[in-house]
Amino acid sequence: EVEKTACPSGKKAREIDESLIFYKKWELEACVDAALLATQMDRVNAIPFTYEQLDVLKHKLDELYPQGYPESVIQHLGYLFLKMSPEDIRKWNVTSLETLKALLEVNKGHEMSPQVATLIDRFVKGRGQLDKDTLDTLTAFYPGYLCSLSPEELSSVPPSSIWAVRPQDLDTCDPRQLDVLYPKARLAFQNMNGSEYFVKIQSFLGGAPTEDLKALSQQNVSMDLATFMKLRTDAVLPLTVAEVQKLLGPHVEGLKAEERHRPVRDWILRQRQDDLDTLGLGLQGGIPNGYLVLDLSMQEALS
């Protein structure tokens, strides 16, 4: 708290301008009218106020708006946004995408802070869903944003928003998240032709079921090994050697380098060694000739 002291003669601020950087904290408190500050918030960012001076300006706004700032002030907070706590932000009602952009710009190039996370949460909840424009904005500032959401939160993403997603936006997503996003992507891109469809759907394939992988294997897609290694193990296991060969095309040779890693390792264990030998890659660990494979999970389901 800054002590209440009278403003020295001749120092009363008539406007928010650069001369205020020379004011001590107590002078800012005494000489800057909160209502003037609120109406000229757009000027604050143009002036190099220090950490301590911004504290005083925030205190003045807090006194003027104890129930939370209006959006007209929020939009022009600039670096003053960095002084806000998540508790402050929870009092706000931010509806404009322009306001969101203005505040994200302040923290650009830095990792997502609790303030930013709270702001985004308030904004998205206010909109009811993560629409395309919002998703576009958020992933532009924070490429990993999508993967920071829970599967439950991702379920509110409409398929139309999937068009805004870039491959790098999914880099840190786990299989549970891709399970939610893949069906939305499949729906969003369903009217595209084969090769274009594969380019768009490729980043989401970590959530694809076996039957979709089987279908892709019939389309000469030449999936690269990096994508194959991100597929769900349970989706890869039922694929035949022929299907994997068709799915990977010329990239099938890469299986040898990955034979000790999932899902390739587990897939090899499920294939007949004879079939693996047809690839000519020297893959070992398949089921020897003459052995009978019992699918115990199927047996349990029947009993």
Partner: nanobody, 116 residues
């Protein structure tokens, strides 16, 4: 993280000149308001010169007419040209602006000593 590197300080006689430079990582100085500050031994850090994001400049009364703040956006560098230096200008000089200023991150500063 933003990095601020001030340089150009040194020992100079009264009446002499120095040109301080401050380089920042990223495009911080090309888009933000910036300022030079100084801290004399046993004193608080105080602003001496500032430039708004619009380019207008302002100076502390004690340095008006002697110091000039400028910036080169292409080099992402801010300068402080100091002339007619006085012993009372002796201090460590810092520059700052934008995100790092709001977050209270500072460089190491550059020391200026004005002595006969």
């Amino acid at each position: 993280q933003v990095q601020l590197v001030e340089s150009g300080g040194g020992l100079v006689q009264p009446g002499g000149s120095l040109r301080l430079s401050c380089a920042a990582s990223g495009s911080m100085f090309s888009i933000n308001a910036v300022a030079w500050y100084r801290q004399a031994p046993g004193e608080q850090r105080e602003p001496v010169a500032a430039m708004t994001s619009g380019g207008s400049t302002i100076y502390a009364d004690s340095v008006k007419g002697r110091f000039t703040i400028s910036r080169d956006n292409a080099k992402n560098t801010v300068y402080l040209q100091m002339s007619s230096l006085k012993p009372e200008d002796t201090a460590v000089y810092y520059c700052n602006g934008g995100w790092s200023l709001a977050m209270d991150y500072w460089g190491q500063g550059t020391s200026v000593t004005v002595s006969p």
